[in-house]
């Protein structure tokens, strides 16, 4: 049994890091493998992650972590029984994938303005709370070409757009994702999408 693709890990910079790797053949990850991880810190304790299958030869492990900060560095040991298959390290702050924003809501009761709001996925005491920027994706269910991205570079988790920038009388969906420049993160996953029917009063044309 050998590791074909070494584990790569990303952290949500809060409580979970996810590591993925591939074996050289079909593997029952949860029964055959264990990923041991330990913070390189005084008094830290070793933890064991039981991996799950991620495709025939792929494995994924969700590592639980406390009080993640930029100084943290973890040792990782991948075991198959008594055999050490791979040894490495992981610094969560250097591989951050933020949590996805939640509670995306479209408020259509403001006069001819769409207000989209969502929740910051981090608590106020987490460093990322004040450092997330967002991308909002809006698309038409009827017209695949009607697909747009709005970059939200301010801290407030909201976006206002004129309803008239979208077509009237059809349904739209929206979703939002986040990233943080300070840690050069990857983008988060998209939030679950929300749907609304876009309708607004066309202004009378003057002749």
């Amino acid at each position: 049994m050998k590791v074909l693709q070494e584990p790569t890990c990303v952290s949500d910079y809060m409580s979970i890091s996810t590591c993925e790797w591939k074996m050289n053949g079909p593997t029952n990850c949860s029964t055959e493998l264990r990923l041991l991880y330990q913070l390189v810190f005084l008094l830290s304790e070793a933890h064991t992650c039981i991996p799950e299958n991620n495709g025939g030869a792929g494995c994924v492990c969700h590592l639980l972590m406390d009080d993640v900060v930029s100084a943290d560095n973890y040792t990782l040991d991948l075991w198959a029984g008594q055999q050490l298959l791979w040894k490495g390290s992981f610094k969560p702050s250097e591989h951050v994938k933020p949590r996805a924003p939640g509670n995306l809501t479209v408020h259509t009761n403001v006069s001819d303005t769409l207000l989209l709001t969502w929740s910051n996925p981090y608590p106020p005491d987490n460093y990322l709370y004040n450092h997330l920027t967002y991308a909002v994706n809006i698309w038409s269910e009827n017209d695949p070409a009607d697909f747009r991205i709005y970059n939200v570079t301010y801290l407030e988790p909201s976006l206002r757009i004129a309803a008239s920038t979208l077509k009237s009388g059809i349904s739209y969906r929206a979703r939002v994702r986040a990233w943080a420049q300070c840690y050069n993160t990857t983008w988060s996953e998209w939030s679950p999408s929300t749907k609304w029917h876009n309708s607004y009063r066309e202004p009378f044309e003057q002749h």
């Epitope: 810190f41 005084l42 008094l43 830290s44 304790e45 406390d66 009080d67 900060v69 930029s70 100084a71 005491d125 460093y127």
Partner: antibody, heavy 116, light 111 residues
Framework: QVQLVQSGAEVKKPGASVKVSCKAS????????MHWVRQAPGQGLEWMGI????????SYAQKFQGRVTMTRDTSTSTVYMELSSLRSEDTAVYYC?????????WGKGTLVTVSS | QSVLTQPPSVSAAPGQKVTISCSGG????????VSWYQQLPGTAPKLLIY???KRPSGIPDRFSGSKSGTSATLGITGLQTGDEADYYC????????????FGTGTKLTVL
């Protein structure tokens, strides 16, 4: 919000021991290390030691080895610092402070006076 | 005694800028991150800067931190009378056993 509530002031005689408590609330108690830091009157901050509340393991500053004991009670989310063989130089305010590499939150402090 | 050295005192007028230095060595500041604490008279210390230059939620951006080599600096702009306090740097040292040294402390007087 995070709160670290410390026990009240103590007056002790030289040679005696003192046990200071620090009750934590507003966060997951076992997820954060706890430090103890003291400050003698008019002096600076002095680190004494650290405890991992999850397993109870400890590490102490060399200066206090053999005299200090840190413990925790997870059922009450409380950490304790006991200092023995007290001398007058141990008169200080003793603080508990939550954190790993740095101290996010501090208790208000417990004044321990050692006097004959 | 502390292995991190700070000036005993600094002073400046309201609205001015002040910097406080913290000098250490390769086994502490040179190999770790620096934090700064503010201690107002008669109160417990409060975390002001961590990770060399990050501010906890609620700390105004008048406070800034930087690190270069084995030294660190705390900067305070737009001084206010309420900033009058003792300031301590802190880090951790892994040269022999893990320890958390603090700086000698700096008394800031707002004139």
């Amino acid at each position: 919000q995070v709160q670290l509530v410390q026990s009240g002031a103590e007056v002790k005689k030289p040679g005696a021991s003192v046990k200071v408590s620090c009750k934590a609330s507003g966060y997951a108690f076992t997820s954060y290390y706890m430090h103890w830091v003291r400050q003698a009157p008019g002096q600076g901050l002095e680190w004494m030691g650290i405890i991992n509340p999850r397993g109870g393991s400890t590490s102490y500053a060399q200066k206090f080895q053999g005299r200090v004991t840190m413990t925790r009670d997870t059922s009450t989310s409380t950490v304790y610092m006991e200092l023995s063989s007290l001398r007058s130089e141990d008169t200080a305010v003793y603080y508990c402070a939550r954190g790993k590499y740095w101290m996010y939150d501090w208790g208000k402090g417990t004044l321990v006076t050692v006097s004959s | 005694q502390s292995v991190l050295t700070q000036p005993p005192s600094v002073s400046a007028a309201p609205g001015q800028k002040v910097t406080i230095s913290c000098s250490g060595g390769s086994s502490n500041i040179g190999n770790s991150y620096v934090s700064w604490y503010q201690q107002l008279p008669g109160t417990a210390p409060k975390l002001l800067i961590y990770d060399n230059n990050k501010r906890p939620s609620g700390i105004p951006d008048r406070f800034s931190g930087s690190k270069s080599g084995t030294s660190a600096t705390l900067g305070i702009t737009g001084l206010q009378t309420g900033d009058e306090a003792d300031y301590y740097c802190g880090t951790w040292d892994t040269s022999t056993v893990w320890e958390w040294p603090f700086g000698t402390g700096t008394k800031l007087t707002v004139l």
